[in-house]
Amino acid sequence: EVEKTACPSGKKAREIDESLIFYKKWELEACVDAALLATQMDRVNAIPFTYEQLDVLKHKLDELYPQGYPESVIQHLGYLFLKMSPEDIRKWNVTSLETLKALLEVNKGHEMSPQVATLIDRFVKGRGQLDKDTLDTLTAFYPGYLCSLSPEELSSVPPSSIWAVRPQDLDTCDPRQLDVLYPKARLAFQNMNGSEYFVKIQSFLGGAPTEDLKALSQQNVSMDLATFMKLRTDAVLPLTVAEVQKLLGPHVEGLKAEERHRPVRDWILRQRQDDLDTLGLGLQGGIPNGYLVLDLSMQEALS
């Protein structure tokens, strides 16, 4: 807490300028009027204050706006934003995308801080949904943002926003998140032609069901192995050898290198060895000829 002392003669600040960097903390407290600070916040970020001094300026703003800062002040916080706590930010009502961008810029190049996470949460809740412009902005600053959301939060993403998503934005998404995003992507890209559609939908295929993979296998898409390895195991298992061959095209040869890894390993175990042999890749572990395949789930239902 800065001690309260009278402002020394001749030191009362008439404007927010660089002379203030030479003030001691108590002088800033005593000589800078909070209302003046609020109206000239746009100058603060250009002045080389220490964070120690910015703490004093924050204290003055807190006294002026105990219920939370107005957006006109928030927009110009600059590095003062780094001194805010999540509790401070929860009092704000940020509606402008420009304000959001200005504050994200301060944290650019660093991992998402609790302050930034709170700011984004407030902003998105205020908007009611993750619209395209917001998503565009957030993924530009934080490529992993989308994958930090819960499936419930992702359900509020409108299909139109999916156009803003880049492949790298989905790198850290787990299957539960892709399960939510895939149907939205399918809807968003539904009017595109075959090859263009596949380029766009490819990153989301970790959420695709079997019937969609079967449909893709009829379109000469030549899926790469990296994409295939991210598919849901339960969606891959029912695919026939012929369907996988069509789905992967020339990349089918890559199955050999992945035969011990999911979902390839589990898929091999479900195929007839005869069928696997037709690929000429030396894949082993299929069902030997003459063996009967029982569907245990069906058997349980009968007993």
Epitope: P48, F49, L82, H110
Partner: nanobody, 116 residues
């Protein structure tokens, strides 16, 4: 984390000179350049001089024309040349900077005493 080490302090008579040096242990990424600060007993720390990232220099009114701040990038040092020293310049002098994450960094300080 980069270390800041000040040296060059001492006891000097009024009107005398001292040259303070601040060595950094590596490259610093500063939001506001490097500053020389001082703290007299019972007082709060105050900025004396600052050199910004673009080389611009700034001085407190009380030291203008007497103190000169400069930097030697090849040696990762920031210097403060203090001339015409006065008793009121007596203090512990610190170099410091602010990073881009919300933290100020200071050296351990070097004592300057101006006394006859």
């Amino acid at each position: 984390q980069v270390q800041l080490v000040e040296s060059g302090g001492g006891v000097v008579q009024p009107g005398g000179s001292l040259r303070l040096s601040c060595a950094t242990s590596g490259t610093i990424f500063s939001r506001n350049g490097m500053g020389w600060f001082r703290q007299a007993p019972g007082e709060q720390r105050e900025l004396v001089a600052r050199i910004l990232n673009d080389g611009t220099t700034m001085y407190a009114d009380s030291v203008k024309g007497r103190f000169t701040i400069s930097r030697d990038n090849s040696k990762n040092t920031v210097l403060l040349q203090m001339n015409s020293l006065k008793p009121e310049d007596t203090a512990v002098y610190y170099c410091g900077y602010s990073d881009y994450r919300g933290t100020d960094y200071w050296g351990q300080g070097t004592q300057v005493t101006v006394s006859s």
